[in-house]
């Protein structure tokens, strides 16, 4: 029950996160005009990944797309790429996780397959969240750098006679949406990975016999673990995912309640 809840919650959290990443990517307010000493402005500038906008105080808003690809800063292109990769991975992760949900029965899908799919989607969510966080952080860093550069030469004089105020940009709403969404996707992914451990079936229901060889302390269990030689087939026991890699001695140190000598 706890596993189902963890998996379901992980799915919902990731879904919200990915929706947020999509929203952030589409938003125009990645950077907004800094109203440092002028809280009320007649012309307000803000920029997104795809277009820049100007909102006039009279109500008129005009947005212009970045119709050039080669003329854009490499950093902006990198942020776009990170956000798109995050969305694509997240979308695939969502698709995979739908089929992996324990509460949904699809034909005769085995728990081991669901566990694998849960783990796959979890990893995808984690990478998706990291991509979004990285993208937003790169953009934020770019803004901070530009902010201090424009502060250094805030007023560029024309022969010392006329002042031209340089527009400074600060963090827009999309950055915060992106950070939160990326974090949620990451958390959702971790939850899916945790749920995956619980989805892995218990040790085989068949009684496993331990054969103790005279000079060795190795337990041979049919299907208990996959030997590197390829023996110990899993087809009947449905045991694919093991909580972690363990040595043969470690396996022997955790005997099943069905073991007998």
């Amino acid at each position: 029950m706890a596993v189902t809840a963890c998996q379901g919650l992980g799915f919902v959290v990731s879904l919200i996160g990915i929706a947020g990443i999509i929203a952030a990517t589409c938003m125009d307010q990645w950077s907004t005009q800094d109203l440092y000493n002028n809280p009320v402005t007649a012309v307000f500038n803000y920029q997104g990944l795809w277009r820049s906008c100007v909102r006039e105080s009279s109500g008129f808003t005009e947005c212009r797309g970045y119709f050039t690809l080669l003329g854009l800063p490499a950093m902006l292109q990198a942020v776009r790429a990170l956000m798109i990769v995050g969305i694509v991975l997240g979308a695939i992760g969502l698709l995979v996780s739908i089929f992996a949900l324990k509460c949904i029965r699809i034909g005769s899908m085995e728990d081991s397959a669901k566990a694998n799919m849960t783990l796959t989607s979890g990893i995808m969510f984690i990478v998706s969240g990291l991509c979004a966080i990285a993208g937003v952080s790169v953009f934020a860093n770019m803004l901070v750098t530009n902010f201090w550069m424009s502060t250094a030469n805030m007023y560029t004089g024309m022969g010392g006679m006329v002042q031209t105020v340089q527009t400074r940009y600060t963090f827009g709403a999309a950055l915060f949406v992106g950070w939160v969404a990326g974090g949620l996707t990451l958390i959702g992914g971790v939850m899916m990975c945790i749920a995956c451990r619980g989805l892995a079936p218990e040790e085989t229901n068949y009684k496993a016999v331990s054969y103790h060889a005279s000079g060795h302390s190795v337990a041979y269990k049919p299907g208990g673990f996959k030997a590197s030689t390829g023996f110990g087939s899993n087809t009947k026991n449905k045991k694919i995912y093991d909580g972690g890699a363990r040595t043969e001695d470690e396996v022997q140190s955790y005997p099943s309640k069905h073991d007998y000598v």
Epitope: E56, S58, G59, F60, Q163, T164
Partner: antibody, heavy 118, light 113 residues
Framework: QVQLQESGPGLVKPSETLSLTCTVS?????????WNWIRQPPGKGLEWIGY???????NYNPSLKSRVTISRDTSKNQFSLKLSSVTAADTAVYYC???????????WGQGTLVTVSS | DIVMTQSPDSLAVSLGERATINCKSS????????????LAWYQQKPGQPPKLLIY???TRESGVPDRFSGSGSGTDFTLTISSLQAEDVAVYYC?????????FGQGTKVEIK
């Protein structure tokens, strides 16, 4: 077509409050645009007083801010100007106007002359 | 406040001749976000409210004859009437809309010589 019409008393006594109303037809004042008041003393230039925009936010000329209030009545599709403690220097033709693209004044009322005199 | 200074104060031009009015602002009116200059030109005839001719320094308002044109960027702007007509006799004002409070030039009176 947006039409604006100013109305109010043509004569106001010094130290009293000047009150004018602009009735808008052909457009809802809550849809878009900023709704401005501009004045022009006889034989002189234009001075922007302030505005109330479609969302109800106001902005005033700092030189008049302490004396000016611009409000609106959405049910009547009107906006109003109140200028307190008037003096003879406030004698002018008062225009209501709509600003939009480029923050430029695209539609104007015919104007109403307000004289401040005892 | 941004101060708008128009020159000349009055201008007498023969019918069919070119009339040029200048407007200078104390600060740049160019917005970096859209590369537009927030300057408008108005025409006011006696007893009438002003009429918008040009906005964004060079965009002609619909219905305005094409003999009216605006140019300039930053702090220096020009309104040109390419061929003066009798109905163009009026006072012309420039207005900055980039920074509050919005301010007007003192006006230029255009007459027929």
């Amino acid at each position: 077509q947006v039409q604006l019409q100013e109305s109010g008393p043509g004569l106001v006594k010094p130290s009293e409050t000047l009150s004018l109303t602009c009735t808008v037809s052909g457009y809802s004042i809550t849809s878009n645009y900023a709704w401005n008041w501009i004045r022009q003393p006889p034989g002189k230039g234009l001075e922007w007083i302030g505005y109330i925009n479609y969302s109800g936010n106001t902005n005033y000329n700092p030189s008049l801010k302490s004396r000016v209030t611009i409000s609106r009545d959405t049910s009547k599709n009107q906006f109003s100007l109140k200028l307190s403690s008037v003096t003879a220097a406030d004698t002018a033709v008062y225009y209501c106007a709509t600003s939009y693209y480029g923050n430029s004044f695209i539609y104007w009322g015919q104007g109403t002359l307000v004289t401040v005199s005892s | 406040d941004i101060v708008m200074t128009q020159s000349p104060d009055s201008l007498a031009v023969s019918l069919g001749e070119r009339a040029t009015i200048n407007c200078k602002s104390s600060q740049s009116l160019l917005n970096s976000g859209n590369q537009k200059n927030y300057l408008a030109w108005y025409q006011q005839k006696p007893g009438q409210p002003p009429k918008l001719l040009i906005y964004w320094a060079s965009t002609r308002e619909s219905g305005v004859p094409d003999r009216f044109s605006g140019s300039g960027s930053g702090t220096d702007f020009t309104l040109t009437i390419s061929s003066l007509q009798a109905e163009d006799v009026a006072v012309y004002y420039c207005q900055q809309a980039y920074s509050f409070p919005w301010t007007f030039g003192q006006g230029t009176k255009v007459e027929i010589k």
